[in-house]
């Protein structure tokens, strides 16, 4: 499959620097190549070299980031790292996640309002719900395939002899303490802000305070405000607003064609950050590994249950993802994965999914076709709520830790980790370390101990970066197959299901290209049935 | 019905080591954690720790490392617990207790107790 | 390590009375609180495990309340075979503790 050459909104071949390093104006032998074509001459090899720079570059950052690491911690000496000397040597590693982070609030916002706006607002519910479907079966795949797994791996009985070494009490401190039913109305309250400013580095959490009412003491639960943006409530207030500024019709368009610009231009932001990528991902997994006190015994030690989540996050990622959009796309999903090379070791070295979200969003656009209105509404919504990765982290950690403790899991038990995991995944909203957090949930929902919460955190930082992987991964293939969707039900309908509101349109007219045209969006037809006027106003819901 | 069945008291002198059976019958034994209880003279109870009995790993209380061992014989499905270098103060009643598959952390089964006396 | 306190340390009763023991953690212990009844000579036996379920075996004048750090054991009608030792122990983080013990005797 040779993917045409990306467009902007004026349907013009887009001349900007592209995901994988050459411009977007590239032949479609370079298109070929970059798509996961074969290169065979030296002439092509070059070419090949050229399409794939951005995608080679990040490969190499983490490999040499790795070994610098090993390097860094093994040598000893001079070499040692304090903690000022580590926050130094960190710090291109720290600029890329400033970079990212610095993107994500406009880019969410904008591509959300943008994205909603764009699309009929039928329509846009029939792709919300094929989004959330998807989403939700991968998700409970990959719990049912962490269950699978640490069941019959046995990662805790293996493991048993880490219990000696951290003591007694595995460090319960560690372990957050919430209700099941105050986390859940927690994540309620994030959708809907109460401050739409403060929802930019802020979000809603429920603590508890132990209070005397008539001589007993009572824990209330008190409302607080903690750092770290409420994506959630971000995502739903612009697909909302983007919906609302549509039903204005001509009033709304300018404010529309203000928030298409400004993500484009943040794209373009995008497209320049991407070849810092790299250099920031070699620092950061380098740090990572430097951090580390002693990777060897850990891993000796807690071996099976890393290879558990890790072995768990590559059949869902290699196989399971691939197959499910290879049944419903009959293309090659592993030509897809190539295009998302770059993101997907941005979200190993970053370890966050809402970080990935920018560079995800260039690639899949200019890489693999997806439809920008496509691409700008799925990601963020998936970026939200979809965890695989972390949904099967959960699992496999539940039963490692009830294996651990020697407490049993019959069928009611197991049931309730796979939901639990699948709901509270939802919860964690693409923060670092959210998945850790919300394993407490699922252990309080079958009664398994939490003291062992200490031993997960320990390995955290490997397994996060896993699941982040997945969790990205899993939103790129949930576009990919909705692209596939859209463009099914384009060629069965003679009507296409969308409107494109004037705005999108550039201001002086041209023929609509192909690439642009989709079920999602509906254009009236002029005298001779050409596609060329856009509705003036969409009819009222 | 589940039965744990403990070795007879023991009198012994500061210094001397003693090892204390605990025999499980009534249930599968790699099931469920083995722990033991001390409650000295007229006192209350103490946990010193617990043996995964799937894995043959020992768990110690923080006030029981070093000269207290666990450990098993699962072919006979028995636990053990040895004390090295007895002190006067190690006088008390020791229990193993059969640690609960459920609900985290209690002991559903107890065996009778063996009292070990440590007296020059 | 959490620490559990009884109350009362001792006390007296006659047959057929309504008897309540309080347990209290030193911190949030959800539900993991369980009760065992001990005879002069004998070893500890499980009453009730997660605040309120009696042991199977166990009669049903026993019963269990509370949540969190605050709980009680309730003996509705007490009967000769009653007075004893009562433990709690809590079992929500490692180390599990018992509290000092209640000492139930005839009046």
């Known amino acids: 499959m040779v993917a045409d050459p990306p467009r902007d909104s004026k349907g013009l071949a887009a001349a900007e620097p592209t995901a994988n390093g050459g411009l977007a104006l590239a032949s479609i032998e370079d298109q070929g190549a970059a798509a996961g074509g074969y290169c065979g001459s030296r002439d092509q090899v070059r070419r090949c070299l050229r399409a794939n720079l951005l995608v080679l570059l990040t490969v190499v950052a983490v490999v040499a980031g790795v070994a610098l690491g090993l390097g860094v911690s093994g040598a000893g000496g001079a070499l040692a790292l304090g903690p000022e000397r580590l926050s130094a040597f960190v710090f291109p590693g720290e600029l890329l996640l400033r970079l990212l982070r610095m993107i994500i609030l406009p880019l969410v916002v904008c591509s959300l309002i943008g994205g909603a706006a764009s699309l009929d607002p039928g329509a846009l519910g029939r792709l919300g719900a094929w989004a959330l479907l998807f989403f939700l079966v991968t998700t409970l795949l990959a719990s049912a395939l962490g269950v699978g797994l640490a069941l019959a791996l046995q990662p805790g009985a293996a493991s048993a002899a880490i219990n000696a070494s951290v003591g007694a009490a595995g460090s319960a401190e560690n372990a957050p303490s919430k209700e099941v039913l105050d986390s859940f109305l927690d994540l309620a309250r994030n959708i809907f802000p109460s401050n739409l400013v403060s929802a930019a580095f802020r979000s809603y959490s429920t603590t508890y305070e132990e209070r005397n009412i008539t001589g007993t003491r009572v824990k209330v639960p008190v409302g607080q405000e903690v750092e770290g943006m409420n994506i959630l409530g971000l995502v739903v207030f612009a697909i909302v607003f983007g919906v609302a500024l549509r039903k204005l019709g001509p009033e709304g368009e300018l404010l529309i064609r203000f928030f298409n610009s400004f993500n484009e231009a943040t794209m373009v932001l995008v497209s320049w950050i991407m070849w810092y990528a790299p250099v920031g991902i070699m620092f950061l997994v380098a740090g990572k590994i430097v951090e580390m006190e002693d990777v060897g015994l850990l891993f000796a030690r807690l071996g099976k249950y890393i290879l558990c989540c890790l072995l768990g996050h590559a059949i869902h990622g290699l196989l399971v993802l691939p197959l499910i959009y290879f049944l419903f796309t009959r293309k090659n999903p592993y030509r897809f994965l190539w295009g998302i090379v770059t993101p997907l070791a941005t979200a190993f070295g970053t370890s966050s999914s809402s970080a990935t979200l920018p560079l995800m969003m260039k690639c899949v656009e200019e890489n693999n076709g997806v439809a920008k209105h496509i691409s700008r509404f799925i990601l963020p919504i998936g970026a939200t709520v979809n965890m695989d990765g972390a949904a099967l982290f959960q699992c496999v950690a539940a039963v490692f830790i009830a294996q651990l403790s020697q407490q049993s899991l019959d069928f009611v038990k197991i049931i309730t980790i796979l939901v639990t995991a699948t709901a509270s995944s939802v919860g964690a909203a693409g923060i670092p370390a959210g998945g850790v957090l919300t394993l407490a949930i699922i252990l309080e929902a079958v009664n398994l101990p939490v003291d062992h919460i200490s031993l997960i955190l320990a390995v955290d930082w490997l397994v996060d970066r896993s699941c982040t992987v997945l969790n990205v991964e899993g939103d790129a293939l949930g576009a990919g197959l909705l692209q596939n969707y859209v463009d099914r039900t384009e060629s069965r309908s003679t009507e296409p299901e969308l409107i494109q509101v004037k705005s999108e349109l550039p201001l002086d007219p041209l023929p609509v290209p192909t690439e642009e045209g989709n079920p999602l969006l509906k254009h009236y037809r002029g005298p001779a049935g050409d596609a060329t006027v856009a509705s003036e106003k969409e009819s009222v819901m | 019905q589940v039965q744990l069945v403990q070795s007879g008291s023991e009198l012994k002198k500061p210094g001397a080591p003693v090892k204390v059976s605990c025999k499980a019958s009534?249930?599968?034994?790699?099931?469920?954690?083995m722990s033991w209880v001390r409650q000295a003279p007229g006192q209350g109870l103490e946990w010193m720790g617990w043996i995964h009995t799937y894995a043959g790993v020992p768990i110690y209380g923080d006030d029981f490392k070093g000269r207290f061992v666990f450990s098993l014989d699962t072919s006979v499905s028995t636990a053990y617990l040895q004390i090295s270098s007895l002190k006067a103060e190690d006088t008390a009643v020791y229990y193993c207790?059969?640690?609960?598959?459920?609900?985290?952390?209690?002991?559903?089964?107890w065996g009778q107790g063996t009292t070990v006396t440590v007296s020059s | 390590d959490i620490q559990m306190t009884q109350s009362p340390s001792s006390l007296s009763a006659s047959v057929g009375d309504r008897v309540t023991i309080t347990c209290r953690a030193s911190q949030d212990i959800r539900n993991y609180l369980n009760w065992y009844q001990q005879k002069p000579g004998k070893a500890p036996k499980l009453l009730i495990y997660y605040t309120s379920r009696l042991h199977s075996g166990v009669p049903s004048r026993f019963s269990g309340s509370g949540s969190g750090t605050d709980f009680t054991l309730t003996i509705s009608s007490l009967q000769p075979e009653d007075f004893a030792t009562y433990y709690c122990q809590q079992g929500h983080t490692l180390p599990p503790t018992f509290g000092q013990g209640t000492k139930l005797e005839i009046k």
């Open positions: 207790a059969r640690r609960s598959d459920n609900y985290r952390y209690f002991f559903d089964y």
């Open positions: 009534g249930y599968t034994f790699s099931t469920f954690g």
